[in-house]
Interface confidence: medium
């Protein structure tokens, strides 16, 4: 009997998607590349449930972790790597006083119980996301 695995080895399944939490650190742009190399995308968050799940993963491991969000194109206008804008309800995920753009902080990370903006050239952990494989048929 063949078992269906919706996600690759060492990836985590959640609500129809697969997530890879890195064990090494890269800058934000290299994190994008790392995800593309495995057929995924630096994580774009689409729902409150997904945010809660990812925040928990990040805070449990006590790691600062890149997500696919930046205001590199236009200061103060936060945009996901898939081109979609940051929804108004998602602004509540920023930590107190963030984003503060201290010293050109243009990329978003999971930090503690919320989000922080930090310098994109800093090496951090990252999370990739891709659709889970279908197990029907």
């Amino acid at each position: 009997e063949r078992l269906c695995h919706p996600c690759p080895w060492e990836w985590t399944f959640f609500q129809g998607n697969c997530y890879f939490m890195s064990n090494s650190q890269r800058n934000w742009h290299d994190s994008i590349t790392a995800c593309q190399e495995v057929g995924a995308q630096l994580v774009v968050i689409k729902s409150a449930e997904e945010q809660n799940f990812l925040q928990l993963q990040s805070s449990r491991s006590n790691r600062f972790t890149w997500m696919g969000l930046s205001d590199l194109n236009h200061e103060g206008t936060w945009q996901w790597v898939d081109g979609s804008p940051l929804l108004p309800s998602f602004k509540q995920y920023w930590n107190k006083g963030e984003p503060n753009n201290v010293g050109e902080e243009d990329c978003a990370e999971f930090s503690g119980n919320g989000w922080n903006d930090d310098k994109c050239n800093l090496a951090k952990f990252w999370i990739c996301k891709k659709s889970a494989a279908s197990c029907s048929g």
Epitope: A48, Q51, Q92, Y93, W94, K96, W115
Partner: antibody
Framework: QVTLRESGPALVKPTQTLTLTCTFS??????????VSWIRQPPGKALEWLAL???????YYSTSLKTRLTISKDTSKNQVVLTMTNMDPVDTATYYC??????????????WGRGTLVTVSS | DIQLTQSPSTLSASVGDRVTITCRAS??????LAWYQQKPGKAPKLLIY???SLESGVPSRFTGSGSGTEFTLTISSLQPDDFATYYC????????FGQGTKVEIK
Amino acid sequence: QVTLRESGPALVKPTQTLTLTCTFSGFSLSTSGISVSWIRQPPGKALEWLALIDWDDDKYYSTSLKTRLTISKDTSKNQVVLTMTNMDPVDTATYYCARTPSGSYGRYFDLWGRGTLVTVSS
Amino acid sequence: DIQLTQSPSTLSASVGDRVTITCRASQSISNWLAWYQQKPGKAPKLLIYKASSLESGVPSRFTGSGSGTEFTLTISSLQPDDFATYYCQQYNSYWTFGQGTKVEIK
């Protein structure tokens, strides 16, 4: 001490434009994460959210009323202004302004003004 | 728009009673829900945020629970000061309030 206070006319005529001012102290609307909202409550009825303005000047409006509403801020005066056009007797309500705090726990309203009653009548 | 439905609309209770108010959302709002208390002629007062977090200064007899679409506010032992109207409010997508639950003296 954080306070918010609403001011504006107690009586407006139908078809007129209502202008309400929220004057606040104890916080700054230039602080990241801070927002100010307007919420109304017709006599004996439920609360209804109208509009919100963020620290970064993003503005959000109630779907059903957005064509009639404009929200703006004057950070230097610590004021938020709401204008509502084409007033009707059904707009008679107590109008509140409220603050949304900074932080990653969400955009709820932690502090409210006392409210100002606006009656629409000819 | 997300709709919130509170039940019951009115609740008659006595001092010392355990009181539960329910708030149902028309779609999932995760835990982005707040509860407010309002007394006649006064502004609403925040009790609970993020579904279960107690606002500073609010008595511990108030507890919130739930996630997704179903939420409850419980008052463990009703006090004379608790007779009021209670509103739930979601902030997952824009902002909407429930229609309110009036807690009155039996």
